[in-house]
């Protein structure tokens, strides 16, 4: 199966790399604009320069292009705890991230929220906190993992999954009681 090409891709494929086909005259290939610039006017003829202008403040293009407008710079989502790692330039979008000892939780492909890494109190660190993943904790005996926190088995209700994890502890207690009576 041949992948479907959009009109723009079809037009671009006729010209060599770094050039695009003139929208009004398909016999002319114009040079694409460098990153950090956008297309103001198509080249008037073969071998003549494309009129490219630098992106204005608050906008960018990150690769060579023939866009009529630069792209708007992204804004870091403060309500998601995001911080600006590097500000927007004419050729690079804003880079947003999280503070130290935080990880990114992606709600969807382009939306992340910053959360504090778990400290594994009443347990040990199985896997360290990473940029996109919380610490993975292993709990000490007498504790079970609930929402990545080690919770005392005394908080384990029969209906919860923790009964399996806390059962050995309960059996041990029964075992000691039994051995004491003989």
């Amino acid at each position: 199966l041949v992948p479907h090409l959009g009109d723009r891709e079809k037009r671009d494929s006729v010209c060599p790399q770094g050039k695009y086909i003139h929208p009004q005259n398909n016999s002319i290939c114009c040079t694409k604009c460098h990153k950090g610039t956008y297309l103001y006017n198509d080249c008037p003829g073969p071998g003549q320069d494309t009129d490219c202008r630098e992106c204005e403040s608050g906008s960018f293009t990150a690769s060579e292009n023939h866009l009529r407008h630069c792209l708007s710079c992204s804004k870091c989502r403060k309500e998601m705890g995001q911080v600006e790692i590097s500000s927007c330039t004419v050729d690079r979008d804003t880079v947003c991230g999280c503070r130290k000892n935080q990880y990114r939780h992606y709600w969807s492909e382009n939306l992340f929220q910053c959360f504090n890494c778990s400290l594994c109190l009443n347990g040990t660190v199985h896997l360290s906190c990473q940029e996109k993943q919380n610490t993975v904790c292993t709990c000490h005996a007498g504790f079970f993992l609930r929402e990545n926190e080690c919770v005392s088995c005394s908080n384990c209700k029969k209906s919860l999954e923790c009964t399996k994890l806390c059962l050995p502890q309960i059996e041990n207690v029964k075992g000691t009681e039994d051995s004491g009576t003989t």
Partner: nanobody
Framework: EVQLFESGGGLVQPGGSLRLSCAAS????????MGWVRQAPGKGLEWVSM????????YYADSVKGRFTISRDNSKNTLYLQMNSLRAEDTAVYYC?????????????WGRGTLVTVSS
């Protein structure tokens, strides 16, 4: 077919409480983050709260922080929103939403909504 059915809305006095429920079916509930979105009369959609599929991650809009609590019961395929200290500005239709893992749009399915009216 994905189905989300909200319930628990109604008329409540300022300062009162309500608990919204959302029964989900037609998809593997445990695999998806879920959320609540609201639309006040004459206004656009606003994210209220989100909860991750398994971990401790939750999101609350600044306007509801400390008053609303989102939770889920994966064994019952149900999402909840406990709403306390309700204010007149919380009046809206509340929609339960399934959050897409892919694409620029976080919200891919939502229910028909339940109306919450806060008035004395």
């Amino acid at each position: 077919e994905v189905q989300l059915f909200e319930s628990g809305g109604g008329l409540v006095q300022p300062g009162g409480s309500l608990r919204l429920s959302c029964a989900a079916s037609g998809f593997t509930f445990t695999r998806y983050s879920m959320g609540w979105v609201r639309q006040a009369p004459g206004k656009g959609l606003e994210w209220v709260s989100m909860i991750a599929h398994a971990g401790p991650e939750t999101y609350y809009a600044d306007s509801v922080k400390g008053r609303f609590t989102i939770s889920r019961d994966n064994s019952k395929n149900t999402l909840y929103l406990q709403m306390n200290s309700l204010r007149a500005e919380d009046t809206a239709v509340y929609y339960c939403a399934k959050i897409s893992q892919f694409g620029s749009n976080a919200l891919d399915y939502w229910g028909r909504g339940t109306l919450v009216t806060v008035s004395s």
